[in-house]
């Protein structure tokens, strides 16, 4: 009886055990007992990324311009083509189907991780002795002024979204 | 360790037979076609015949046909060349291999040979 | 029969050279060929199957090319071990059939 599976890298068709073809070509005709499988190489703008029975190449993926897109990565016979986003943007998926600009951080908020061409600004909260008093996509938060450190002592507390206000010090004699 | 032995070479004389054998061991050796593939002295490699896993698809090379027979026997684990009516021409290193594919004795590659066994057909 | 045709029959390198040896076939075999390895007194051994995927622990300096009628075996960095001769064959179509093999010597 004929095998009911083949190996790695084959298909069982007419109880014969048949080579998929190798990425970067398609299935022209199945094999038999004295051809080998027929394949043919994919065509500039498509590919197959896998040993495959596929009788159709893939299209390449298009980086629409008008989605914000650009090319990353030419696609070859074996692989698509990576799209990434423009400067100022980054991809709404995965699959980078289309760009959104980057976040800001509000105030009070600062840059935890500058945004990529796939992923968006991160904002964490400033903590207590920094601030951020604009909104921005790379600017982190800062630390309060030390009044100290300048012979001054503090006037008006700092906070989240604003700076200490440092003055002179009283000079009263005791 | 994965390996296929052959035997059964040696001196003979033309119009006289020959039966080489091959011993496998390592792998299952009814899961592949097998063939026998020689080499003359000084020369390339000639495929000779192929055998499919379940000896239903059995092969030979234009030179051989009629004169040589390919045979199998999965519980000996064992590959079997019968050489009738040898001829001067047929004097070369005779090797056992194994195909990684399982369902055609007709074509294939070879990711596993034997050391081989020479068989001299001489008067 | 589908004729393979090596060229050259031989090549003379050195240790570090860069090796090119090529196959060409009568009629189109997409990517169905495979290279050995064979030395003096020795099996043939495999090395590249489907024309470019290296067999399982042969070492990364071999490489092959090629699709339709025309291949390439490579060398990238000769080494001692590496003088040898070496078959290509067609598994494309009944019979299976071998090049004329290229000796690779010291030079």
């Known amino acids: 009886e004929p095998p009911t599976a083949c190996r790695e890298k084959q298909y069982l068709i007419n109880s014969q055990c048949c080579s998929l073809c190798q990425p970067g070509q398609k299935l022209v005709s199945d094999c038999t007992e004295f051809t080998e499988t027929e394949c043919l190489p994919c065509s500039e703008s498509e590919f197959l990324d896998t040993w495959n029975r596929e009788t159709r190449c893939h299209q390449h993926k298009y980086c629409d311009p008008n989605l914000g897109l650009q090319v990353q990565q030419k696609g070859t016979s074996e692989t698509d083509t990576i799209c990434t986003c423009e400067e100022g943007l980054h991809c709404t998926s995965e699959s980078c189907e289309s760009c959104v600009p980057h976040r800001s951080c509000l105030p009070g908020f600062g840059v935890k991780q500058i945004a990529t061409g796939v992923s968006d600004t991160i904002c964490e909260p400033c903590p207590v002795g920094f601030f951020s008093n604009v909104s921005s996509a790379f600017e982190k938060c800062r630390p309060w002024t030390s009044c100290e450190t300048k012979d001054l002592v503090v006037q008006q507390a700092g906070t989240n979204k604003t700076d200490v206000v440092c003055g002179p010090q009283d000079r009263q004699r005791a | 360790e994965v390996q296929l032995v052959e035997s059964g070479g040696g001196l003979v004389q033309p119009g006289r037979s020959l039966r080489l054998s091959c011993a496998a061991s390592?792998?299952?050796?009814?899961?592949?076609?097998m063939h026998w593939v020689r080499q003359a002295p000084g020369k390339g490699l000639e495929w000779v015949s192929g055998i499919s896993w379940s000896s239903d698809s059995i092969h030979y090379a234009d030179s051989v046909k009629g004169r040589f027979t390919i045979s199998r026997d999965n519980a000996k684990n064992s590959l079997y060349l019968q050489m009738n009516s040898l001829r001067a021409e047929d004097t070369a290193v005779y090797y056992c291999?194994?195909?990684?594919?399982?369902?055609?004795?007709?074509?294939?590659?070879?990711?596993?040979w034997g050391r081989g066994t020479l068989v001299t057909v001489s008067s | 029969d589908i004729q393979m045709t090596q060229s050259p029959s031989s090549v003379s390198a050195s240790v570090g050279d860069r090796v090119t040896i090529t196959c060409r076939a009568s009629k189109v075999i997409s990517s169905w060929l495979a290279w050995y390895q064979q030395k003096p007194g020795k099996a043939p051994k495999l090395l590249i199957y489907a024309a470019s995927y290296l067999e399982s622990g042969v070492p990364s300096r071999f490489s092959g090319s090629g699709s339709g009628t025309d291949f390439t075996l490579t060398i990238s960095s000769l080494q001692p071990e590496d003088f040898a001769t070496y078959y290509c064959?067609?598994?494309?179509?009944?019979?299976?059939?071998f090049g004329g093999g290229t000796k690779v010597e010291i030079k």
């Open positions: 390592g792998f299952t050796f009814d899961d592949y076609a």
């Open positions: 291999a194994k195909d990684p594919t399982a369902t055609t004795g007709a074509r294939g590659y070879f990711d596993l």
């Open positions: 064959q067609q598994h494309s179509s009944f019979p299976p059939t």
